[in-house]
Amino acid sequence: WPPPGTGDIIVQAPTQVPGFLGDSVTLPCYLQVPGMEETHVSQLTWSRHGESGSMAVFHQTQGPNYSEPKRLEFVAARLGTELRDASLRMFGLRVEDEGNYTCLFVTFPQGSRSVDIWLRVLAKPQNTAEVQKVQLTGKPVPVARCVSTGGRPPAHITWHSDLGGMPNTSQAPGFLSGTVTVTSLWILVPSSQVDGKSVTCKVEHESFEKPQLLTVNLTVYYPPEVSISGYDNNWYLSQNEATLTCDARSNPEPTGYNWSTTMGPLPPFAVAQGAQLLIRPVDKPINTTFICNVTNALGARQAELTVQVKEGPPSEPSGMSSN
């Protein structure tokens, strides 16, 4: 707002006023008169830059006159009162209402005093974020999608991620004329390490008090990644039974585990129990390579582990007895 005048009358108004599409907005405009100054306002006038004629006039004796009576209204000006408040209300804001307006007071004997106000027509966007479920493509693909719908001006979208990648942002006209829908994709090369991790879409718009943060949990479909655990290279004869575990990471979850050996089916001392393989005590040394084959909807993968059961008791309980 301009500083108060010291001796002269002055028109006070904000340089910019925001309003929302379809809503009403008040363009404030006041005449400030120093204490000693005598003035008489005969007319208030609102006009739009680049247009001939006035859109709203309030005359001291004739009252208001509007170019669009259903959409315009003087907020405070009334016949028979001092015309010091020219504030104008606009209803049903349209995109084409955005622009520069002049509020003018005709005062006597000082003459005309005016101020320009920029009306910004805003539309608050609706924001959504969703995962783009992908498989291991080996090349960059969209893994998350963030959409800011129907904003005016267009929303600004950024991404926050520890996974690497890059954004791809585009704009398209919104449903309402003058609005814009912004779509941003987060693109990276999918890997199993990405699955289950999150990225955050940040949407900024001047209609928001603070940026909106939308978190997306990523989904990467991949076949099983398999390993076998439970063997520590120190298994001996005459020890307790032990367990091998088939560790599988996959998306979707594994649908089946199949144990075998390089020689074919499992030997009698090995009993499959789903993801686990129970190794019972044996009375002679063995050297067997076990295979765990894991299946999910995308395929099957396997891991191998060679187990040796050696002669001679350990110096202290370990090996098979440790499991």
Epitope: D8, P34, E38, S42, Q60, P109, Q110, G111
Partner: antibody, heavy 121, light 109 residues
Framework: QVQLVQSGAEVKKPGASVKVSCKAS????????ISWVRQAPGQGLEWIAW????????NYNQKFTGRVTMTTDTSTSTAYMELRSLRSDDTAVYYC??????????????WGQGTTVTVSS | QAVVTQEPSLTVSPGGTVTLTCRSS?????????ANWVQQKPGQAFRGLIG???NRAPGVPARFSGSLLGDKAALTLSGAQPEDEAEYYC?????????FGGGTKLTVL
Amino acid sequence: QVQLVQSGAEVKKPGASVKVSCKASGYTFTSSYISWVRQAPGQGLEWIAWIYAGTGDTNYNQKFTGRVTMTTDTSTSTAYMELRSLRSDDTAVYYCARHGYTGRGWYFAVWGQGTTVTVSS
Amino acid sequence: QAVVTQEPSLTVSPGGTVTLTCRSSTGAVTTSNYANWVQQKPGQAFRGLIGGTNNRAPGVPARFSGSLLGDKAALTLSGAQPEDEAEYYCILWYSNHFVFGGGTKLTVL
């Protein structure tokens, strides 16, 4: 064309009142500001007051407050100035003047021919 | 009340330029005084020339111009004509009242 025609000369006794009229033509009377100005013999011009014809809003020179009343009759497009408690130093030619507007500033546009008021016992 | 002072008389040759000034007893004349200038020819009614310091009234020849000159209001007549011979009054606004100057008698000789 725009014209202001004032009433004729008046001779008044001290303590009396005088009411001078100013009939306007050629423009929208209700949208106008009219000032009253006087000039005493051998003296300069002195502003008395202005009135906004449409509403009757007025602004008086403090020197005359309480003694002068300005009114308008919009039906006849006439402005009036009444001065009470007349003294001999109120003897002067009284003028009405319509203020015009250029779009940026006001000016003393059109003047009446003047009304001579003589205050004498 | 303030006193507004003008040159009592000035003379200009036909076609010449002359500047009439208007001084305020309260200090510098500013745009907030909305200086007005009116003309009165002998036997004729007053006529408004300038309002709001420098706004020429409709129909007033362009040879008349209003301005602020230093701490005074000024009326400049460029290319004086014999018909410009008249009395010129300056009027200043002081927050809530007008004050007239004593007038300048301009002779075109």
